[in-house]
């Protein structure tokens, strides 16, 4: 019983030898080439690798496994036949030779054979399971490939339709561009014609400008002569006035006393009995500093201090901050009285501002503000206005609330540009706002479509340059 040995013979067949008493039994079992050798035991529950095998490799392995199964099946059949043959022979021998107690040994041998068969069967089952597992995985992979292919096909179809749409859109745009090009060519031709016309016009204007420049030179010379004459006349008049006041004071001391009174504004001059239009000397409030101003003693009851006048373009209004501060020009003609004096005056008591305008067609209009004052220089002579009435527009052409004063060298406007440089002249520019009475003076027939002219938007629009303007102030209680 216990003398049971297992060994390998020279040709690689498994050999089972059983020694029992004087009898010895040897079984030779065939070992299949493709079966796993006993030296590397097969582990049926080994973990499958996660990474999918290459499709061709999987197919190849499947074929190998199929071959193994086929071989195993053949081997089993051979084994069965072999066992049956051996059993028959052994049974005959046993029946012929064996004694009764030999039966147990035969049973043991049979059991061993059955165990061997069971082991081979289990191995086959494991192989079968692996093959099935691999087949299932391959089927899943194939399914995934199929789905992926369908998805790609759908994407290709979508992209194709998108391309078609884009091509349609492109052709539509091409047509549009062509149409625009045609239109552009026509416009270019039109512009070229206009350019040619403009060039003719420019050359005409150049010749006119040359003539005007010659006239200006002549006029400047004449003007210098006239100014000298005017200066001489003024001196003579002043001498006469001095002589008169001297003779008057000798006759009547009370008159002399009255002549020495200083006037703050034209309203005081008017109230003192001087009711004739003209230039008067005014004194700064709380100071002895004097300034010459033109007084309108006739319009609207008189007593108006003229703070600005434009009438003929004889004075350049593109001046510095300092010039606008102290004043410039000629009080009998075009001039600016001075921001400092007006600021001090209008902060002493309440003043009204009247702006009188004339166009080139003989029309006149005005804007009257019932309260007007200028802030100090520290606050850039900001303008403050209230209560508009008049015929030059229902909306104030001086932007509300008031803006700071700006000049070519003092940019205090609300524009990223420099309004004073762009539109010329010092003014209470917004950005740049609906008015500028200190703009460039343009003569008749050249006064339209000018962005830098003398402008009062709510009367004549943005491009109309006015013929004449007057800004005048008077105490509100006059």
């Amino acid at each position: 019983y216990n003398n049971f040995r297992k060994s390998m013979d020279s040709i690689g067949k498994k050999q089972y030898q059983v020694q029992h008493g004087s009898c010895s039994y040897t079984f030779l079992l065939p070992e299949m080439d493709n079966c796993r050798s006993s030296s590397s035991p097969y582990v049926s529950n080994a973990v499958q690798r996660d990474a999918p095998l290459e499709y061709d490799d999987s197919v190849q392995r499947l074929q190998v496994l199929e071959n193994i199964m086929e071989n195993n099946t053949q081997w089993l059949m051979k084994l069965e036949n072999y066992i049956q043959d051996n059993m028959k022979k052994e049974m005959v021998e046993i029946q012929q030779n064996a004694v009764q107690n030999q039966t147990a040994v035969m049973i043991e041998i049979g059991t061993n054979l059955l165990n061997q068969t069971a082991e081979q069967t289990r191995k086959l089952t494991d192989v079968e399971a692996q093959v099935l597992n691999q087949t299932t995985r391959l089927e899943l992979q194939l399914l995934e490939h199929s789905l992926s292919t369908n998805k790609l096909e759908k994407q290709i179809l979508d992209q194709t339709s998108e391309i078609n749409k884009l091509q349609d859109k492109n052709s539509f745009l091409e047509k549009k561009v062509l149409a625009m090009e045609d239109k552009h060519i026509i416009q270019l031709q039109s512009i070229k014609e206009e350019k040619d016309q403009l060039q003719v016009l420019v050359s005409k204007q150049n010749s006119i400008i040359e003539e005007l420049e010659k006239k200006i030179v002549t006029a400047t010379v004449n003007n210098s002569v006239l100014q000298k004459q005017q200066h001489d006349l003024m001196e003579t008049v002043n001498n006469l006035l001095t002589m008169m006041s001297t003779s008057n004071s000798a006759k009547d001391p009370t008159v002399a006393k009255e002549e020495q009174i200083s006037f703050r504004d034209c309203a005081e001059v008017f109230k003192s009995g001087h009711t004739t239009n003209g230039i008067y000397t005014l004194t700064f409030p709380n100071s002895t500093e004097e300034i010459k101003a033109y007084c309108d003693m006739e319009a609207g009851g008189g007593g108006w201090t003229i703070i600005q006048r434009r009438e003929d373009g004889s004075v350049d209004f593109q001046r510095t901050w300092k010039e606008y501060k102290v004043g410039f020009g000629n009080p009998s003609g075009e001039y600016w009285l001075g921001n400092e004096f007006v600021s001090q005056l209008t902060n002493q008591q309440r003043y009204v501002l009247k702006i009188h305008l004339k166009d080139w067609e003989g029309n006149e209009a005005y804007s009257l503000y019932e309260h007007f004052y200028l802030s100090s220089e520290e606050l850039n002579y900001r303008i403050h206005l209230k209560g508009l009435t008049g015929t030059a527009g229902k909306i104030s052409s001086i932007s509300q609330p008031g803006n700071d004063f700006s000049t070519k060298d003092g940019d205090n406007d609300k524009c990223i540009c420099k309004c004073s440089q762009m539109l010329t002249g010092g003014w209470w520019f917004d950005a740049c706002g609906p008015s500028n009475l200190n703009g460039m003076y343009y003569p008749q027939r050249q006064n339209t479509n000018k962005f830098n002219g003398i402008k009062w938007y709510y009367w004549k629009g943005s491009g109309y340059s006015l013929k004449a303007t007057t800004m005048m102030i008077r105490p509100a209680d006059f």
């Epitope: 229902k394 909306i395 479509n449 962005f451 830098n452 629009g461 943005s462 491009g463």
Partner: nanobody, 120 residues
């Protein structure tokens, strides 16, 4: 942002009438002068009419004087052009435009236009 939208154009027989409207938004309509300008097919832009900010002053091109009337309703932010006794030569795209403060009599904003066709 400033927007001007014209409406009221269409096909009309010679001698007929049309009223164009221009709805303004994005700015203080009552503070600006407004204009009507037209462009006949294949021709340049031609000024038609203008109105001041409060509607008290109007002006017209000689070709439309006595036939066209410009008006405005500041409460409704709308500009109008009443066109009577229309002629074939009035066929054009009509634009409303705003005159800016510092535009030198030019227009700083335009509408997209409305087509008026006078034909029998």
């Amino acid at each position: 942002q400033v927007q001007l939208v014209e409406s009221g154009g269409g096909l009309v027989q010679p001698g007929g009438s049309l009223r164009l409207s221009c709805a303004a938004s994005g700015y203080t309509f009552a503070a600006y002068w407004m204009h009507w300008v037209r462009q006949a097919p294949g021709k340049g832009l031609v000024w038609v009419s203008r109105i001041n900010s409060d509607g008290s002053s109007t002006s017209y091109a000689d070709s439309v004087k006595g036939r066209f009337t410009i008006s405005r309703d500041n409460a409704k932010n709308t500009l109008y052009l009443q066109m009577n006794s229309l002629r074939a030569e009035d066929t054009a795209v009509y634009y409303c435009a705003r005159e800016g403060y510092s535009s030198g009599g030019q227009f700083d904003y335009w509408g997209q236009g409305t087509l008026v066709t006078v034909s029998s």
